[in-house]
Structures are given as C-alpha cells and as structure tokens.
C-alpha cells in the first residue's frame, strides 16, 4: 500500500521539494524526538492483574534492529489473593509501528517501509460469553 | 527500491556518513493491519482498566491518524461495576516510529520521528510508600 498523499493544494510547489526518483521517497534518518523516554509506571508488567513477559527479536537488516514483543503470562487474570481467576481473560494490547527493512538490488542497498504489529502489554477483560441456543 | 543498480564492482557511496538520507520504496510491506483500534477489538470497554480512544490527526505525518488511549478511572473496575481505588489503572505506553514530512507539505520527503503513544490501560497493584 502506498503512502497516501494529502490534498495537492496543501503541498508546496514541486520545485521547492527535493527531487525523488519515481516510486521512492527521500527519508532523513536523523530522528526527531530521539531523546524522549517512556515514562511508564515502574514494573507494570509484573504488577498488572494481567502480567506479561517481554521477548526481544534482533535483526541486523531492520531499523530499529530490535523489536520488543509482550506475551501475556496467563489466560486468566490474577486476583487479590494472587491466584489466577479464569473467569476473566488476559488479552494482548497491540500497536502498529513502522520499521525500515534493508533490501539489496544490484549494487544498491535500499530500504523498504514495513508495518509491524507490536504487542505492547496485556489488559484484563471480562470474557465475551456466547450463549448456545 | 533506490538508485539504479550498477555493475562491475559497485562504486563508492558518496557520503561518508551514509545513510543519513536514504531512499525508501514507497510500497509499504505489511499485513493489512487495522489502524482503527475501535474496529479491531472492544477491549477498551471490557477491560477492568477501561480507556477512551482519542483520534490524533496530523496530515504532515505518516500515519496521519494515531489513536491515543486515556484511562477512564484512577482505580480499576470490579465485577459489580464499581471502581476499586485500591488498584490503579495505568497507561501502557509505546514508542513508535512515524514519518514526518520534511520540508513541510512535500509529498515524498520525510524524516523519521519517534513518538510516544498510550496504547491502552492495565490494572496494577499500587506501589505503597511507607512514611517512617
């Protein structure tokens, strides 16, 4: 799927934009907001009633090279007594992010945008009960 | 892809700091994941730490629409529907990469940007600080 262009009246005249080969886009890899930090509460993955573990996958042909995925520890949720309550469900919360995938064509190293679905954590939900007629 | 492939033991990359600027194929490789979390699941309503989803739209960014979660309560919802303030609803945050049009309004020129999004909420046991 191509990156959608917003209404053309909104754009600057082409001469004020950098020239880009057909079918490509120019991407500056200097990252904006590089030094902002996730201000999440401490250790929420272990304090949650739907706790989760993290696994990291590393790939030298991707930027960023590491992608962190959460996995819910239980099917149910942890109750006040610290026991698993299977009348509730631990479910994954997912978010889409972009990564750059390195490609090789002839003598050129290029990049392709890729959407990756990341499981960020888990939440405890009331199950959907399907009643059989 | 980017530049036209050349043969005979490919030439140097001109820029010593390659690739500060890279050419990127415009076709996005992905499974067609839904960008509207309301459509993909109703966890935001069924969770013991429910959240509201706010649409953040910016035509200078790709993706232009990002949904931000805001926890509805400080506490967590019990089975009887009441809020238990002995537990806390907290946002789950994630840093994601997006593209920012640079220069502004240019259709095919971007810069990477990291943004922090709240994806949903989870119910946690509070950290209790005892005063001596």
């Amino acid at each position: 799927r191509k990156i959608p262009k917003v209404g053309h009246t909104f754009f600057q005249k082409p001469e004020s934009c950098p020239p880009v080969p057909e079918g490509s886009m120019k991407l500056d890899t200097g990252i904006i907001n590089e030094n902002q930090r996730v201000s999440m509460s401490r250790n929420i993955e272990s304090r949650s009633t739907s706790p989760w573990n993290y696994t990291v996958t590393w790939d030298p042909n991707r930027y960023p090279s590491e992608v962190v995925q959460a996995q819910c520890k239980h099917l149910g949720c942890i109750n006040a007594q610290g026991k698993e309550d299977i009348s509730m469900n631990s479910v994954p919360i997912q978010q889409e992010t972009l990564v750059l995938r390195r490609k090789h064509q002839g003598c050129s190293v290029s990049f392709q945008l890729e959407k990756v679905l990341v499981t960020v954590g888990c939440t405890c939900v009331t199950p959907v009960v399907h009643h059989v007629q | 892809g980017i530049a036209i492939p050349r043969n005979s033991g490919c030439p140097n990359s001109e820029d010593k700091n390659f690739p500060r600027t890279v050419m990127v194929n415009l076709n996005i490789h992905n499974r067609n994941t839904s960008t509207n979390p309301k459509r993909s699941s109703d966890y935001y309503n069924r969770s013991t730490s429910p959240w509201n989803l706010h649409r953040n739209e910016d035509p200078e960014r790709y993706p232009s629409v990002i949904w931000e979660a805001k926890c509805r309560h400080l506490g967590c919802v019990k089975a009887d529907g009441n809020v238990d303030y002995h537990m806390n609803s907290v946002p789950i945050q994630q840093e994601i990469l997006v593209l920012r049009r640079e220069p502004r309004h240019c259709p095919n020129s971007f810069r990477l940007e990291k943004i922090l999004v709240s994806v949903g909420c989870t119910c946690v046991t509070p950290i209790v600080h005892h005063v001596a």
């Epitope: 890899t29 990252i31 042909n61 930027y63 090279s65 | 700091n17």
Partner: antibody
Framework: QVQLVQSGAEVKKPGASVKVSCKAS????????LHWVRQAPGQGLEWMGI????????NYAQKFQGRVTMTRDPSTNTVYMELSSLTSEDAAVYYC????????????WGQGTTVTVSS | DIQMTQSPSSVSASVGDRVTITCRAS??????LAWYQHKPGKAPKLLIY???SLQSGVPSRFSGSGSGTDFTLTISSLQPEDFATYYC?????????FGGGTKVEIK
C-alpha cells in the same frame, strides 16, 4: 568526522573484571548501534555483542552471556563494555565499532584497547 | 549460529598480482556479507558491504561478488599497502560472525 576513542590498556588478574570505554563523536550518537569485537593474540575477530545507544538495549553473543555487560551514557556519548571473571583466554585487543544504519556491518572502529590477564 | 569459512588461510603474492579470497557461509545469507582489511596494531577497515558495494574511500582495485553461501573478494592488482589480513563477516542475522581470516603476505 566520525571518531571512536577507546580507553587505555589494562592489566588484570584472573577472576577480576575490566571495563573499557568508547567515546563517540562526529555523528548523532543515538542513531547508530555500537558493537564490541575482540581479537586474541594469533586469533581472528570475534563479535561480542551490540548496544542500542538510544534505549540501551543489548544483544550478547552466547559465549559471553552472563559475563559481559554493555552500557551507555548518552550525556557523554560513551559506551562501556565490562567483562567479568577474566581468564588468560580473555587477553585480547577489544574494539568498539559503529554499526551502519541498520547495524549489520561495522563502518567505523575504535583504535582498540589491549587487555592483559596475568597473575 | 552461521559459520563463516574463509580460504585460503594465507596467500603469498607479489605487487601487481591478482588475489582472490573466498568465503563460504554455513547457510544462505543473501547478499549480507562484508569484507574487512586488518593490519597489525590498527583497527579493522570496512572494504566491501552488501557483498559487492565498495565502502567510501576504498580503492576500486577491491571488488566483491557472490550471494547465498559463496562469496569472493578480489584485489585486481596488489599494492604494497594491501599486505594485511582480510576477514569476511555475515550481516544476515545475530550473532554476527567472522571468517577465520586470510593473511596476504609478500612472496
């Protein structure tokens, strides 16, 4: 221009730990991954691990797991590699090297730090 | 882990000679291979990346080829400054791994 400057030579006793630093300059520190590679006398190059200077996340070669710790200090654009429980087999020249944008090959290298392990 | 096997382990050659070094991966690595030159007391230097792309500032007498499992580094006309040890390195997956090295010596 891009430069990676490492700390000086170290002499350590078996069982001790060593911490080598690598100060980066001439580029945006947090964008490029940093690797550690070593070369023991008469041996080839051996990859030890990688650190993302942005978040500090690391990936270590299995051989060094549990013994190596890579850290970074973005305020000084410096990365560190600490190796514990040293034996004579850890005597080597240790290099830090910058991974190009998506981290797979190493385009700039530090000058190397010689670590001698002897009782 | 992917094993990288380099051959020969050493080669004696004269200035002006054409030198070929080969590198074999234990599994397919597409074109994700780099070549380095290493001289005693110096830091290794990246020569070739992505199997055949010449790193900036590297003389054109160095060239690389191959994909999949078999790769070659060629020095078309050996110069006095080229006497060194050459290493291949796979960049396909972690852990990154190097070949054992090929020492190019003066005949």
């Amino acid at each position: 221009q891009v430069q990676l400057v490492q700390s000086g030579a170290e002499v350590k006793k078996p069982g001790a730990s060593v911490k080598v630093s690598c100060k980066a300059s001439g580029y945006t520190f947090t964008i490029y991954y940093l690797h550690w590679v070593r070369q023991a006398p008469g041996q080839g190059l051996e990859w030890m691990g990688i650190i993302n200077p942005s978040g500090g996340r690391t990936n270590y070669a299995q051989k060094f797991q549990g013994r190596v710790t890579m850290t970074r200090d973005p305020s000084t654009n410096t990365v560190y590699m600490e190796l514990s429980s040293l034996t004579s087999e850890d005597a080597a020249v240790y290099y830090c090297a910058r991974g190009e944008f998506s981290s797979g090959w190493l385009d700039y290298w530090g000058q190397g730090t010689t670590v001698t392990v002897s009782s | 882990d992917i094993q990288m096997t380099q051959s020969p382990s050493s080669v004696s050659a004269s200035v002006g000679d054409r030198v070929t070094i080969t590198c074999r991966a234990s599994q397919g690595i597409s074109s994700w291979l780099a070549w380095y030159q290493h001289k005693p007391g110096k830091a290794p230097k990246l020569l070739i990346y992505a199997a055949s792309s010449l790193q900036s500032g590297v003389p054109s007498r160095f060239s690389g080829s191959g994909s999949g499992t078999d790769f070659t580094l060629t020095i078309s006309s050996l110069q006095p400054e080229d006497f060194a040890t050459y290493y291949c390195q796979q960049a396909n997956s972690f852990p990154l791994t190097f070949g054992g090295g090929t020492k190019v010596e003066i005949k």
